[in-house]
């Protein structure tokens, strides 16, 4: 009696169980009563990552540099190419089909945590005594200049966006 189900790594065709092609190979012809399934390796730019009965291999992903992508891991006959973003960029989504610049922290904010491939920059407000006058994805809040150590006095107070302005001591006060 012909089978109605086949073992793992087999498929049912024409009332008989044929072996699936192994990862990295595509189906050329189904098995018969007298012959085994015929499979052929995928070409250099192609892959199949499962036991299969596909007649065509899949094309490796192209990491388009115009979209900010670069190769993280070259594809093999059994795996797809893995793309990642160039320095200073991160993926727009899990599939990483394109990249965008890391979020910049606005003036008055500094970088608490630099972006990763899957999460954007974490910014934090500059606390009292610190400032940031630039929009940056890498710069932390910087401390106000210490006028005293330069034998100067504060002429203008600092803010979260500006450094203090130092000036000479008022000689009259001596």
């Amino acid at each position: 009696e012909p089978p109605t189900a086949c073992r793992e790594k087999q498929y049912l065709i024409n009332s008989q169980c044929c072996s699936l092609c192994q990862p990295g190979q595509k189906l050329v012809s189904d098995c018969t009563e007298f012959t085994e399934t015929e499979c052929l390796p995928c070409s250099e730019s192609e892959f199949l990552d499962t036991w299969n009965r596909e007649t065509r291999c899949h094309q490796h992903k192209y990491c388009d540099p115009n979209l900010g992508l670069q190769v993280q891991q070259k594809g093999t006959s059994e795996t797809d190419t893995i793309c990642t973003c160039e320095e200073g960029l991160h993926c727009t989504s899990e599939s990483c089909e394109s990249c965008v610049p890391h979020r910049s922290c606005l003036p008055g904010f500094g970088v608490k945590q630099i972006a990763t491939g899957v999460s954007d920059t974490i910014c934090e407000p500059c606390p009292v005594g610190f400032f940031s006058n630039v929009s940056s994805a890498f710069e932390k809040c910087r401390p106000w200049t210490s006028c005293e150590t330069k034998d100067l006095v504060v002429q203008q107070a600092g803010t979260n966006k500006t450094d203090v302005v130092c000036g000479p001591q008022d000689r009259q006060r001596a």
Epitope: H90, C91, T116
Partner: antibody, heavy 121, light 107 residues
Framework: QVQLVESGGGVVQPGRSLRLSCAAS????????MHWVRQAPGKGLEWVAL????????YYADSVKGRFTISRDNSKNTLYLQMNSLRAEDTAVYYC??????????????WGQGTLVTVSS | DIQMTQSPSSVSASVGDRVTITCRAS??????LAWYQQKPGKAPKLLIY???SLQSGVPSRFSGSGSGTDFTLTISSLQPEDFGNYYC?????????FGQGTKVEIK
């Protein structure tokens, strides 16, 4: 579809500890930062803690710093919140929250149903 | 920390009405703002992110606008299922903070 299921809430005395868990499914857990957000009865939302996708960095609200610890087990698709030295003001519904990630980082796109923690003597 | 202030604290409107909720940040947050809806006894749900981007699956009657410090959530034609609390959240800087909420009631 994305599912976040919290457990471990309950009634606890001040000064005691509690551990919350959150089982995640329907997305690649290991690719996303996760958060805990809480809501005291009849009050608004308060962000509590963040853990990065790989657990390499963790951040906390000042109100829980030094008392709460966020952690994750990517092999089990589970997020945790260890809460020590609990106070009455920690009484709230605690939500496990998925970060939207990538260029939408720090927006909260999926929330669990919440688990109630009551700190009372 | 950045303070988020919502107004009004509550609004009562009829089905079909246009409802507007505003959110003000204590510092410039560019467009890093989200809006959430929360129904009684339920978890919040993301409606709008990046000030004006509609989250997948959210009805187009919800829209967001604004940048810098002033933001608006608009429900163009209020539906019975839109009752609940609405919260804004700034995603510009740590720690992430929410507005105090606006209660929307159906007349």
């Amino acid at each position: 579809q994305v599912q976040l299921v919290e457990s471990g809430g309950g009634v606890v005395q001040p000064g005691r500890s509690l551990r919350l868990s959150c089982a995640a499914s329907g997305f690649t857990f290991s690719n996303y930062a996760m958060h805990w957000v809480r809501q005291a009865p009849g009050k608004g939302l308060e962000w509590v803690a963040l853990i990065s996708f790989d657990g390499s960095y963790k951040y906390y609200a000042d109100s829980v710093k030094g008392r709460f610890t966020i952690s994750r087990d990517n092999s089990k698709n589970t997020l945790y919140l260890q809460m020590n030295s609990l106070r009455a003001e920690d009484t709230a519904v605690y939500y496990c929250v998925k970060d939207a990630g990538y260029s939408s980082s720090w927006f909260f796109d999926y929330w669990g149903q919440g688990t109630l923690v009551t700190v009372s003597s | 920390d950045i303070q988020m202030t919502q107004s009004p604290s509550s609004v009562s409107a009829s089905v079909g009405d246009r409802v507007t909720i505003t959110c003000r940040a204590s510092q410039d947050i560019s467009s890093w703002l989200a809006w959430y809806q929360q129904k009684p006894g339920k978890a919040p749900k993301l409606l709008i992110y990046a000030a004006s981007s509609l989250q997948s699956g959210v009805p187009s009657r919800f829209s967001g606008s604004g940048s810098g410090t002033d933001f608006t959530l608009t429900i163009s034609s209020l539906q019975p299922e839109d009752f609940g609390n609405y919260y804004c959240q700034q995603a510009n800087s740590f720690p992430w903070t929410f507005g105090q909420g606006t209660k929307v009631e159906i007349k």
